[in-house]
Amino acid sequence: EVEKTACPSGKKAREIDESLIFYKKWELEACVDAALLATQMDRVNAIPFTYEQLDVLKHKLDELYPQGYPESVIQHLGYLFLKMSPEDIRKWNVTSLETLKALLEVNKGHEMSPQVATLIDRFVKGRGQLDKDTLDTLTAFYPGYLCSLSPEELSSVPPSSIWAVRPQDLDTCDPRQLDVLYPKARLAFQNMNGSEYFVKIQSFLGGAPTEDLKALSQQNVSMDLATFMKLRTDAVLPLTVAEVQKLLGPHVEGLKAEERHRPVRDWILRQRQDDLDTLGLGLQGGIPNGYLVLDLSMQEALS
């Protein structure tokens, strides 16, 4: 194998071009200068190198930049990005949104890998907060991105960025995350009129408190059952039958199909049966007439 370490005569690469496409691993290693590669990274992506060949090119860059690649190289990594480890990426300082977009484009179609998560983390930390342009970019590539953040991380999202959020971006968020996002959304959309406001706020309502749901019930919003089923149980329980009827409008009939599921099931248990009967839906399980309801949580608070 020793004789293979020298570049064969006439094979030394003068530029990164398609003539390298059938170079074997050892030929790429011996015949491609790392500094040349770094200055012509933009050409690599135009050549359909195999994964084996990309491994060699990565190795050459690693030797040239042991402390981490400069952004001028990172921006043009192309498919070579798929060969990077999170440890490689932690050495980078990515400040340009264009660089981030270029690398996310390469990863399009893949799940969010540990490499991408590390890249985003480095980028956002470098910026100090998740600004609107960054959030726009991230949710465009990864609709579930917001829901992958912890409530603590979400607290750094400025209300102005909420305008970039689409309903599908929140599909996998849990109540703790929506608790953080809802007040931001409320602030972001506060100057909108009733019906427009509801359209925008609807997907965030899993973080809404009881008083906001009561206020919405006065605005003829006709909330659909899917949204209602995602509301916080503790926020739904204090609503009266009349308030739920107003909140759901024509969709109130859907309660029957959901009567065994939370939060509908728990809400039914808190209502008087004769109030439930006024809906005419055959909902069962309410408090029988003549029973007294004690709010133990109020008693504990007073004592």
Epitope: E18, I21, N45, A46, P48, Y51, E52, Y79
Partner: antibody, heavy 118, light 106 residues
Framework: QVQLVESGGGLVKPGGSLRLSCAAS????????MSWIRQAPGKGLEWVSY????????YYADSVKGRFTISRDNAKNSLYLQMNSLRAEDTAVYYC???????????WGQGTLVTVSS | IQLTQSPSSLSASVGDRVTITCRAS??????LAWYQQKPGKAPKLLIY???SLESGVPSRFSGSGSGTDFTLTISSLQPEDFATYYC?????????FGGGTKVEIK
């Protein structure tokens, strides 16, 4: 939309020649590497030949080396395969396919049948 | 690099979960693509990088694996999925295909 249309197939005697063409449209042909892939009746796929975007770098499978010549004309958005000294085992449907950035075949033509028989 | 697909053919019903495997003669990282070919038609790219779905391909198709063992799964077989499926490696030149797996109606 992307279209690749092959032509030039037909019946030829052993030792004869054929020239296949592939007309491309709907994408920037000069940015793409192009390939010929063949499929013998009832068999699997075999990568036959490969040409770089400018036409300067070429690959042939051992089974066709010295007999087949791949070429392209970027001005005409066309790919060609000149097949000489044809043998019975060259009988197959020949597909042209495009390669962009990764060595995978993202677009394929509908194929043209080459039958080598006496 | 040789690719061996198994089974070479299988019979299944609409709604079935179908799994096809592709084994490489040496490690190929995640450099594997899957194609679907219907009778009389050209192959169509389904999956690349072992698990990435090509744009426009239904989500019932999924790929997995790395190294030498790879799997193509159809979660709920549809009438239009009866076809022959091929794997292809792009870890090193020359590019090679598996022998194919024909999915037939039971």
């Amino acid at each position: 939309q992307v279209q690749l249309v092959e032509s030039g197939g037909g019946l030829v005697k052993p030792g004869g020649s054929l020239r296949l063409s592939c007309a491309a449209s709907g994408f920037t042909f000069s940015d793409y590497y192009m390939s010929w892939i063949r499929q013998a009746p009832g068999k699997g796929l075999e990568w036959v030949s490969y040409i770089s975007s400018s036409g300067s770098t070429i690959y042939y499978a051992d089974s066709v080396k010295g007999r087949f010549t791949i070429s392209r004309d970027n001005a005409k958005n066309s790919l060609y395969l000149q097949m000489n000294s044809l043998r019975a085992e060259d009988t197959a449907v020949y597909y042209c396919a495009s390669v962009h950035k990764k060595p995978i075949f993202d677009y394929w033509g509908q194929g043209t049948l080459v039958t080598v028989s006496s | 690099i040789q690719l061996t697909q198994s089974p070479s053919s299988l019979s299944a019903s609409v709604g079935d979960r179908v799994t096809i495997t592709c084994r490489a003669s040496q490690g190929i990282s995640s450099a594997l693509a899957w194609y679907q070919q219907k009778p009389g038609k050209a192959p169509k790219l389904l999956i690349y990088d072992a698990s990435s779905l090509e744009s426009g391909v239904p989500s019932r198709f999924s790929g997995s694996g790395s190294g030498t063992d790879f799997t193509l799964t159809i979660s709920s077989l549809q009438p239009e999925d009866f076809a022959t499926y091929y794997c292809q490696q792009f870890n090193s030149y020359p590019l090679t295909f598996g022998g194919g797996t024909k999915v037939e109606i039971k």
